[in-house]
Amino acid sequence: KAMHVAQPAVVLASSRGIASFVCEYASPGKATEVRVTVLRQADSQVTEVCAATYMMGNELTFLDDSICTGTSSGNQVNLTIQGLRAMDTGLYICKVELMYPPPYYLGIGNGTQIYVIDPEPCPDSD
């Protein structure tokens, strides 16, 4: 009955501060409405990074000011987090909720450790 969620253990953000990873869930029911939330865990504190609810077969829509974008395909969600800095390095957890129709199901991944390295500033040319 419990829902399993899989995500990669480690991802390295690009030099532009963009990190992408796949969040895949094994659906125990036939959900038509799914909510995906990205959580960040640091020092045992958990905060919400972004969230989107989507209809199966439709695109994910995050809020306009969200740092996340994503696409869905079946039971797989491709998530992209933008604007990351070195201080944002941490564990990013994918949380999936099957909202409709009932029953509700919750699935939480083990987290993806995202490493962000700030680019070195370009040296001044003489």
Epitope: K1, K95, M99, Y100, Y104
Partner: antibody
Framework: EVQLVESGGGLVKPGGSLRLSCAAS????????MNWVRQAPGKGLEWVSS????????YYADSVKGRFTISRDNAKNSLYLQMNSLRAEDTAVYYC???????????WGQGTMVTVSS | NEVLTQSPGTLSLSPGERATLSCRAS??????LGWYQQKPGQAPRLLIY???TRATGIPDRFSGSGSGTDFTLTITRLEPEDFAVYYC?????????FGQGTKVEIK
Amino acid sequence: EVQLVESGGGLVKPGGSLRLSCAASGFTFSSYSMNWVRQAPGKGLEWVSSISSSSSYIYYADSVKGRFTISRDNAKNSLYLQMNSLRAEDTAVYYCARVGLMGPFDIWGQGTMVTVSS
Amino acid sequence: NEVLTQSPGTLSLSPGERATLSCRASQSVSRYLGWYQQKPGQAPRLLIYGASTRATGIPDRFSGSGSGTDFTLTITRLEPEDFAVYYCQQYGSSPWTFGQGTKVEIK
């Protein structure tokens, strides 16, 4: 301080109605799903109903389906439970509880007592 | 519906002793299991979530273990304030269900 405070409990006759309220403070109420959980005298905990942050998704226990209605007003930081066709077996302390980001019920109110008796 | 069975119903122990409480699920709940403490006249308080993660502010004498169908809450050295009723809860699917509770009383 993160806090939930229930009100509206009391004595009501079988078949009667009651509306419970839960006032939230100290956190962004509109970001969290909320629940009602009850506890009959000397008994264990029983989940009653759940409502998502934007009220889009609502769930009920079979024991109250068709009789109870959960709702919320995010502008007022308040959660409600409208209870109709009350029965003696609905007698309990009713708690409102917040759903934490990782799933469990992480913050609870102090409860309000509902007694259904003739 | 997921049924959670707690054992024993009552545990009689002295302060300083170790308490081991069990919770068994009728089907796998993975690690979507929480433990709550309730004292007389008070609301439940979250102790453990995700089967083994302590909630904020919970002392390290409380620990949780298990996954699937069998779970354990351990209190390593009972303090006077730990005598209470403990409930397990599964939150992986609706309806959300609780065990019937284990009372930890002073021997």
